[in-house]
Interface confidence: low
Amino acid sequence: KEVCYERLGCFSDDSPWSGITERPLHILPWSPKDVNTRFLLYTNENPNNFQEVAADSSSISGSNFKTNRKTRFIIHGFIDKGEENWLANVCKNLFKVESVNCICVDWKGGSRTGYTQASQNIRIVGAEVAYFVEFLQSAFGYSPSNVHVIGHSLGAHAAGEAGRRTNGTIGRITGLDPAEPCFQGTPELVRLDPSDAKFVDVIHTDGAPIVPNLGFGMSQVVGHLDFFPNGGVEMPGCKKNILSQIVDIDGIWEGTRDFAACNHLRSYKYYTDSIVNPDGFAGFPCASYNVFTANKCFPCPSGGCPQMGHYADRYPGKTNDVGQKFYLDTGDASNFARWRYKVSVTLSGKKVTGHILVSLFGNKGNSKQYEIFKGTLKPDSTHSNEFDSDVDVGDLQMVKFIWYNNVINPTLPRVGASKIIVETNVGKQFNFCSPETVREEVLLTLTPC
């Protein structure tokens, strides 16, 4: 079957849209009138109250839309709505760093139904966004290169459809945990893929299988750059007990949403924080998350590391290939940004059994104490570890070393760090030295060698 609409063209239920393994039911999308796609414009001039706009010259001209600015569309997912706080929060953070037309796309008319139907309705949403982009081009000479479409869950595939319909001319699409059911393993035509825009970046946060784990997001790579924070399956801070999950810092409603789909929603929270932390989400190219956590992917290669989220487009190698995979760790609550350091400690003093911790002090801030090693502390041995600091300390000025005994030792042994090397993710090294030793639980300050 096929249905046709004046503005948006025809939609069929032929393969691959329906009748394939991943979507066996022959279902057509609802009509544009029923999906009721709305465009809610926020700008630097109206950051708190949207202006509803349409693909119409008088509507655009009568709004705060500026043709000399980039335009970022934000598309929500299943059951969600365009007036939800998270979309406006993305816009508000954008206004802190740029002048931009920020358009929240509401399609709750089509998202609040069964999942299978909603997964078809995104075709209408994508067509509506494509129509809007093409209208801006024809009416105002506005280049699709200046358009960035950000889509969460089903919205990521709606963004892909918008990109496909504009022949890949859209500047950028960001997929925030693109939805898995009805999309994973399907042909590129149906889902978000790298040919949908000049640059496609993706954040995976809920990649466990939908059955039996209820992972709503794709594990499949679908962009030029695919980021897997915390491995892309289980996000820190999402395993709280029910009460603390629901009574959330952002309120009961956000807490209830988190309880239902915490990992899945983390993707847009990471993106929101990334806007105001331009270097706080460095993604490391690596074979797998296991290899990353084994400290085998540090520092960044000579070409640098891309930043997950808003600043991914600054990465020089962003379109060198498709399906480039990157790994990183984040915090367990906002601010989610983290800065990774490698610390190598060369010990001096007595041989004891215990553990050593180091804290960093720099021109931008100071870190907490992080454990570098636990076990036998032998003089002249060197121990290394990587950790993710919630503070960007900047250029290192000094480090502090402390050690703890694992067993009571009446001889009060002294241990020191003759040298500590701190390496930042860009490979910059800082060397600190001290000839001294200290008793356990006493801080030793090391200064540049």
Epitope: N146, G168, G171, K198, F199, T319, N320, D321
Partner: nanobody, 121 residues
């Protein structure tokens, strides 16, 4: 198959101006960065100016304030306006673009044949 065709080179007096054009043709999906490079005999090809699809530009120090790069995305064309030309600007000027052919996912680096700019004193 994607081609780049430069035009606008020639002989000009020191202090004069020239405008180079480079048009991309063929099966183009999209173009990311476009730019101009130049090469003198026995030397490496050096970047002169680049412009990204969003409009951000980058210039070699030696041409800042004298050369202006611009681009027409609808025509898949990049321009280099060269003012206050100096004899040391004499070189073969090459157009460069990162092009994603239609219905593919990877960008390819494409070069033009080059156009000679001669600045006489």
């Amino acid at each position: 198959q994607v081609q780049l065709q430069e035009s606008g080179g020639g002989l000009v007096q020191a202090g004069g101006s020239l405008r180079l054009s480079c048009a991309a043709s063929g099966s183009i999906g999209s173009i990311h960065t476009m730019g101009w490079y130049r090469q003198t005999p026995g030397k490496e090809r050096d970047v002169v100016a680049t412009i990204q699809d969003g409009g951000s530009t980058n210039y070699a120090d030696s041409v800042k304030g004298r050369f202006t790069i611009s681009r027409d995305n609808t025509l898949n064309t990049v321009y280099l306006q060269m003012n206050d030309l100096k004899p040391e600007d004499t070189a073969v000027y090459y157009c460069n673009a990162d092009v994603r052919p239609y219905r593919t996912s990877r960008y390819l680096e494409v070069w033009g044949q080059g156009t000679l700019v001669t600045v006489s004193s």
